[in-house]
Amino acid sequence: YPYDVPDYAGGGGSGGGGSMMTGTIETTGNISAEKGGSIILQCHLSSTTAQVTQVNWEQQDQLLAICNADLGWAISPSFKDRVAPGPGLGLTLQSLTVNDTGEYFCIYHTYPDGTYTGRIFLEVLESSVAEHGARFQIP
């Protein structure tokens, strides 16, 4: 990810931060989607008055996108064709492949609380399987 040249376009979580951290992150949890389709990854930080300065979306340790309070969205160039910002602080993944199966994290950088992290597990299914609503749960 070439950090020096960002492309900014306008405008069940855990906290790792301060001793007064009261916030919680609600996520879409474990979800499945059809190969070739799209999915919305959503997190919501609640129960805190902390100021959200930035939200990072990561897949494992790979940065997908950033939503910065001052600058808006930046999408990693390697995901530009398949990742769309929003809705809200969420992220839309398009043209899904089975390789997109895995863990996704929303990382909320807040003040004064610190960092809150939410986890989503996405399973991308072959079309015929997805049509029959097959799902699995992470224990």
Epitope: P6, G16, G18, D70, T115
Partner: antibody
Framework: EVQLVESGGGLVQPGGSLRLSCAAS????????MHWVRQAPGKGLEWVAF????????YYADTVKGRFTISRDNAKNSLYLQMNSLRAEDTAVYYC????????????WGQGTMVTVSS | DIQMTQSPSSLSASVGDRVTITCRAS??????LAWYQQKPGKAPKLLIY???TLQSGVPSRFSGSGSGTDFTLTISSLQPEDFATYYC?????????FGGGTKVEIK
Amino acid sequence: EVQLVESGGGLVQPGGSLRLSCAASGFTFSNFGMHWVRQAPGKGLEWVAFISSGSSSIYYADTVKGRFTISRDNAKNSLYLQMNSLRAEDTAVYYCARMRLDYYAMDYWGQGTMVTVSS
Amino acid sequence: DIQMTQSPSSLSASVGDRVTITCRASKSISKYLAWYQQKPGKAPKLLIYSGSTLQSGVPSRFSGSGSGTDFTLTISSLQPEDFATYYCQQHNEYPWTFGGGTKVEIK
């Protein structure tokens, strides 16, 4: 090449004021949050203040809150630290540092400017 | 504030040695720890962030590990240019805090 150059340091009496500047080049300054970090002679590093890219978020260490003011002028690619009511314990080398875009750590630092508070 | 404790405060080693520096946080900081190298009269240089991610341009002999409260910086084969002071720093919450430093000297 990313460059950060601090200036404005010097000798000042206790209770006095000083304004530090940091001139940035080699990157899009207006896209990055910036920090001031200081280091007293022979001591470790101490975070002082942070300002986000558009100045909407500003944070200070408790030791300087109410006395120091961080600001920036994106049109001039410059970062500032206005230091008032200076104390002997503020004596240090002051570094400006760039925040990584992902908000994880400070990836480029200036060479520092020395501030000495003494009568 | 989160206290960061580094150990040892100094160590002597030879070129080619494997060097390990540890950093302990007073409470969990998840993976959000950075390591910096500082040489006398110079500015700190970022080596590692988020516990284990190598900053661009940093030699691969440097590695970081750990999460929660306990972290380690390892230099697999010490080179002459590695003699310096190393600082850990938590970037999980404000105020960002640094460890006291570990000075790596020539034996």
